[in-house]
């Protein structure tokens, strides 16, 4: 058993049929010594008396808010949550496996630049009695500070018969050094509580590996005289790190016909313009990637050819 | 070339070669096949590789103030990785394909380090840790770890030379 926060405790249980459970001793936070009784949740049934209560925690029915009273007055509370371990593996019932970029991906994180700011998100099908708390650090043995905000519900989607809820959180490294080569990864820890079930999820990454620039901005076409060619120009996204002479991007320009089956013409360039042939009914798209490190491409910015 | 007394390196040449190094480092370690899956243990790690850290003056402001600190750090790293790529870790079993980019990568690391340091002048170089794993799987794992950290190192070096070529070239 360990303390999650004041008066909230997590009991770690091996979860299998007829498991013996864990013996837990609760102590009433009071100078009083006698006349103390204990109850669980809203029930008025007295579970025991005395300053301490010993219980055998085996299942969710044994978890909940234990309260000690004296003469009708509440002295203190202890909320017990359960953390299930099945076949030696902690349960992951609360969050949905996003399966991208690989199986068992519960947390996904992205950064728009090298400022030390990043966003993580996760999915669940649970709509009520759900709380999240997020902590982060750079490195784990001698951790350096990363400050995370509160997790918020950022999207709701209908998937077949189910509703899916996306939560996200923004974090900022306290003393970020955008130009340095990271040697210690960022660690993100999410505590999830659904009713009386506790779970924790972690992710470890370098900012350089989660970089995904915003799409190029101000995408424009300029027809070239007496030619089917056009000059496409664009600018670095506002959110990208500066100066651009240092934090450089490379770009992919694509000409795509109306039909998905039509051959795509692609050009790669480090410049912020390119000359391409504009076919009728086609569109021109541009995306960006860090020039020197192969992290994710941005989403496409697109304009119609016409 | 970076020489004592602080004269400038051939920024544009360094920019071109460092960008080539980035491409080679990624082609030498594509994340594919069963090797992309998981790493087996951490018996032999690459914690001792030189990193370009916050205080090394490799940020735009630090380069403007005095690029020598940063260039020395980059040079140190280039020599370190050049020695690793020439060691038994990469030459032993399992053998690389004959036209593997590792050979070119090795030569390019040497080329860039020579651009930064003329003959007859020696910056301090970092000691290479004595990594000589006995098992082929340990060597293979170590190769991937080295190449992965090299990708990060050369990315920073390439940014430095690109910025230098754009803003510090005579």
């Amino acid at each position: 058993i360990w303390e999650l926060k004041k008066d909230v405790y997590v009991v770690e249980l091996d979860w299998y049929p007829d498991a013996p459970g864990e013996m837990v001793v609760l102590t009433c936070d009071t100078p009083e010594e006698d006349g103390i009784t204990w109850t669980l949740d809203q029930s008025s049934e007295v579970l025991g008396s005395g300053k301490t209560l010993t219980i055998q925690v085996k299942e969710f029915g044994d978890a909940g808010q234990y309260t000690c009273h004296k003469g009708g007055e509440v002295l203190s509370h202890s909320l017990l949550l359960l953390h299930k371990k099945e076949d030696g593996i902690w349960s992951t019932d609360i969050l949905k496996d996003q399966k991208e970029p690989k199986n068992k991906t519960f947390l996904r994180c992205e950064a728009k630049n090298y400022s030390g700011r990043f966003t993580c998100w996760w999915l669940t099908t649970i709509s009520t009695d759900l709380t999240f708390s997020v902590k982060s650090s750079r490195g784990s043995s001698d951790p350096q500070g990363v400050t995370c905000g509160a997790a918020t519900l950022s999207a709701e989607r209908v998937r077949g018969d189910n509703k899916e809820y996306e939560y996200s959180v923004e974090c900022q490294e306290d003393s970020a050094c955008p130009a340095a080569e990271e040697s210690l990864p960022i660690e993100v820890m999410v505590d999830a509580v659904h009713k009386l079930k506790y779970e924790n999820y972690t992710s470890s990454f370098f900012i350089r590996d989660i970089i995904k620039p915003d799409p190029p901005k101000n995408l424009q076409l300029k027809p070239l005289k007496n030619s089917r060619q056009v000059e496409v120009s664009w600018e670095y996204p506002d959110t990208w790190s500066t100066p651009h002479s240092y934090f450089s991007l490379t770009f992919c320009v694509q000409v795509q016909g109306k039909s998905k089956r039509e051959k795509k013409d692609r050009v790669f360039t480090d410049k912020t313009s390119a000359t391409v042939i504009c076919r009728k009914n086609a569109s021109i798209s541009v995306r960006a990637q860090d020039r020197y490190y192969s992290s994710s491409w941005s989403e496409w910015a697109s304009v119609p050819c016409s | 070339r970076a020489v004592p007394g602080g004269s400038s390196p051939a920024w544009t040449q360094c920019q071109q070669l460092s960008q080539k190094l980035c491409t080679l480092a990624w082609s030498a370690h594509p994340l594919v096949g069963h090797m992309d899956l998981r790493e087996e243990g951490d018996e032999e790690t690459t914690n001792d590789v030189p990193h370009i850290q916050c205080g090394d003056g490799c940020d735009p402001q630090g380069l403007r103030d005095n690029s020598q600190f940063c260039l020395q750090r980059i040079h140190q790293g280039l020599i370190f990785y050049e020695k690793l790529l020439g060691s038994d870790i990469f030459t032993g079993e399992p053998s690389l394909l004959p036209d593997s980019p590792v050979g070119q990568l090795h030569a390019s690391l040497l080329g860039l380090s020579q651009l930064l340091q003329p003959e007859g002048h020696h910056w301090e170089t970092q000691q290479i840790p004595s990594l000589s794993p006995s098992q082929p799987w340990q060597r293979l794992l170590l190769r991937f770890k080295i190449l992965r950290s090299l990708q990060a190192f050369v990315a920073v070096a390439a940014r430095v030379f690109a910025h230098g070529a754009a803003t510090l070239s005579p």
């Epitope: 593996i89 690989k102 199986n103 068992k104 | 082609s27 030498a28 370690h29 594509p30 594919v32 096949g33 069963h34 090797m35 899956l37 998981r38 790493e39 087996e40 243990g41 399992p94 053998s95 690389l96 394909l97 036209d99 593997s100 980019p101 590792v102 082929p136 799987w137 293979l140 794992l141 991937f144």
Partner: antibody, heavy 118, light 111 residues
Framework: QVQLQQPGAELVRPGASVKLSCKAS????????MNWVKQRPGQGLEWIGM????????RTNQKFKDKATLTVDKSSSTAYMQLSSPTSEDSAVYYC???????????WGQGTLVTVSA | DIVLTQSPASLAVSLGQRATISCRAS??????????FHWYQQKPGQPPKLLIY???NLESGVPARFSGSGSGTDFTLNIHPVEEEDAATYYC?????????FGGGTKLEIT
């Protein structure tokens, strides 16, 4: 040395699922992938899927996604494969094999012969 | 899925001679640095045994008369000089992408 112990044989009724075991010893069980491979009598080898014991991440051959469920018990260093609704097509030898960075199936168990018969 | 076609299906070789087994992949299983290609030997009633990994590297404890070569789509296993104990079925396997697949096998008979 690395050892993967599998029961020699399992007789199973059609439609009654069967759970095959593979007990690992001689190495750190949570450090590498455990693969499962099928071999029908007198036939070739088919890769079913694999599981990483550290967090139970699985990768399954699409052909077997509705047939095989892979699990592990870290406390006993044992990998399991459950075959659902077995038919005569599932009668085969099933091997577990430890993957390494050099090759995906380096160390093999002796195999369990599953016979599906009424 | 990548299909591996092994040839011949069976092979008879005299003691001391060379046995050559080929395997062709339906698409390249190599990157710029490695070929994700392996050879196994299987004897009746036994599990397969890894002989060659990453196309040309001899697994520890395997006799030096076994050698592997090739890259891209075409790979070869050579055994020279063949010994009695080499009578077995040989399988190729790739691990370039999921799912890993095996060749159909080549049965080697020693005459």
């Amino acid at each position: 040395q690395v050892q993967l112990q599998q029961p020699g044989a399992e007789l199973v009724r059609p439609g009654a699922s069967v759970k095959l075991s593979c007990k690992a010893s001689g190495y750190s069980f949570t450090s590498s992938w455990m693969n499962w491979v099928k071999q029908r009598p007198g036939q070739g080898l088919e890769w079913i899927g694999m599981i990483h014991p550290s967090d139970s991440e699985t990768r399954t051959n699409q052909k077997f996604k509705d047939k095989a469920t892979l699990t592990v018990d870290k406390s006993s260093s044992t990998a399991y494969m459950q075959l659902s609704s077995p038919t005569s097509e599932d009668s085969a030898v099933y091997y577990c094999a430890r993957g390494m960075i050099t090759a995906p199936t380096v160390y093999w168990g002796q195999g369990t012969l599953v016979t599906v018969s009424a | 899925d990548i299909v591996l076609t092994q040839s011949p299906a069976s092979l008879a070789v005299s003691l001391g001679q060379r046995a050559t087994i080929s395997c062709r992949a339906s698409k390249s299983v190599s990157t710029s640095a490695y070929s994700y290609f392996h050879w196994y030997q299987q004897k009746p009633g036994q599990p397969p045994k890894l002989l060659i990994y990453l196309a040309s590297n001899l697994e520890s404890g395997v006799p030096a008369r076994f050698s592997g070569s090739g890259s891209g789509t075409d790979f070869t296993l050579n055994i020279h000089p063949v010994e009695e104990e080499d009578a077995a079925t040989y399988y190729c396997q790739h691990s370039r992408e999921l799912p890993w697949t095996f060749g159909g096998g080549t049965k080697l008979e020693i005459t």
